[in-house]
Interface confidence: low
Amino acid sequence: EVEKTACPSGKKAPEIDESLIFYKKWELEACVDAALLATQMDRVNAIPFTYEQLDVLKHKLDELYPQGYPESVIQHLGYLFLKMSPEDIRKWNVTSLETLKALLEVNKGHEMSPQVATLIDRFVKGRGQLDKDTLDTLTAFYPGYLCSLSPEELSSVPPSSIWAVRPQDLDTCDPRQLDVLYPKARLAFQNMNGSEYFVKIQSFLGGAPTEDLKALSQQNVSMDLATFMKLRTDAVLPLTVAEVQKLLGPHVEGLKAEERHRPVRDWILRQRQDDLDTLGLGLQG
């Protein structure tokens, strides 16, 4: 530890400003009052401090708020947020969406760090559920956020929040997650007309049961092969050749290219050859 504590005459910082970038670490420690720093945190982001200098500023805040920073300070942390550890963040009580946005902005363009994951976890737990505004914000910054949650965590997502979900937000979800999300989506979109409903529900269909797929096949939805390939195998197997033909519409010809891949492969093996031949695709059961 570098111990240079006595502030040289005339160096006491009256405010947080550009002149502090010329202070060495020990001078920041000695000459910047922690309470002043806390009240002028919004200025820190505009000053090009080095990582080492930011370490000192963090240290001062830690000493001022050993039980965790108040939200007024957290909201203005800016790049200092990158210096926080998950342990630091677990002490926080973040309730404002504006605070969350401000901190996510700092990490924008990077993968979700353990710090961000902890921050989001604290925020969502504080709110009690993943409401639409929060989900909107989180998926805007991290399209893969929803798929990073466990099925248990996803169970707390209210159906109304599903409106904030975009197709790309579900790209990395596995079947267990879609099993949880699909019923919520079905409920959220239940009052839409057929064609609009399919557009919205399409990305969630990896969690759909057989009976829902059968119902969709009666609605001329023309499901594309990419969506079909993401369906649960156990949900696809009971479908008849006629139902799959109706479900896929003009896209049925794509089955030939996918005949060696699940769930198409497994579905073909369950069908009578005579029925497959009606498709005229040369599929062999």
């Epitope: 111990e3 006595a6 060495k24 670490k25 020990w26 001022l64």
Partner: antibody, heavy 112, light 112 residues
Framework: EVQLQQSGADLVKPGASVKLSCTVF????????MHWVRQRPEQGLEWIGR????????IYGPKFQDKATITADTSSNTAYLHLSSLTSEDTAVYYC?????WGHGTTLTVSS | DIVMTQAASSEPVTPGESVSISCRSD???????????LYWFLQRPGQSPHLLIY???NLASGVPDRFSGSGSGTAFTLRISRVEAEDVGVYYC?????????FGAGTKLELK
């Protein structure tokens, strides 16, 4: 590991000047703050002053304002203590230090 | 200047027992960051001083946890539990709150 290597013992005559050196190893010298402390025979410790090698800014204890000059050479990672108008009162061990690291001390004897 | 006072010039102790060494300052050493800038050094016979405790209660690296520092504002205590032969020497307190840095006169720990 940080090491502070001080110059050897010196015997000088009253009225003369002397320059003691302290070379730092294992540390970024510009990030240091080199202090000098003296200890007269059978006495306690007295702070002489310190230098910031990055900008040569130095501060002295009131008692040493006219006695001591601390300088630093960043190219050799060495701090110097220049003592002038020496009297027998200046006979002491002079230590350079950086926070928790002390040199072994240089014994200065002022005698005719 | 801040005056540091170590009332006891010597402290006799039996090996294995505990001992407390006290130090006072004539001004509070509490910095606005919540730390008390009080240091403890040990100078063993014939050696340079070395740091034991910094910021009143923090153990310097390599120092056994038999040593502990406490206090507040102007009154400070260095406690050594289970004193060993190697603990013999002069203990100095020093304030690092403002310049000039000042030391106490020292307390000599002697074995009975």
């Amino acid at each position: 590991e940080v090491q502070l290597q001080q110059s050897g013992a010196d015997l000088v005559k009253p009225g003369a000047s002397v320059k003691l050196s302290c070379t730092v190893f294992g540390l970024n010298f510009k990030d240091t703050f080199m202090h000098w402390v003296r200890q007269r025979p059978e006495q306690g410790l007295e702070w002489i002053g310190r230098i910031d090698p990055a900008n040569d800014n130095s501060i002295y204890g009131p008692k040493f304002q006219d006695k001591a000059t601390i300088t630093a050479d960043t190219s050799s990672n060495t701090a110097y203590l220049h003592l002038s108008s020496l009297t027998s009162e200046d006979t002491a061990v002079y230590y350079c230090l950086y926070f928790d690291n002390w040199g072994h001390g240089t014994t200065l004897t002022v005698s005719s | 200047d801040i005056v540091m006072t170590q009332a006891a010039s010597s402290e006799p102790v039996t090996p294995g027992e505990s001992v407390s060494i006290s130090c006072r300052s004539d001004k509070s050493l509490l910095h606005s960051n919540g730390h008390n800038y009080l240091y403890w050094f040990l100078q063993r016979p014939g050696q340079s001083p070395h740091l034991l405790i910094y910021r009143m209660s923090n153990l310097a690296s390599g120092v056994p946890d038999r040593f502990s520092g406490s206090g507040s504002g102007t009154a400070f205590t260095l406690r050594i539990s289970r004193v060993e032969a190697e603990d013999v020497g002069v203990y100095y307190c020093m304030q690092h709150l403002e310049y000039p840095l000042t030391f106490g006169a020292g307390t000599k720990l002697e074995l009975k």
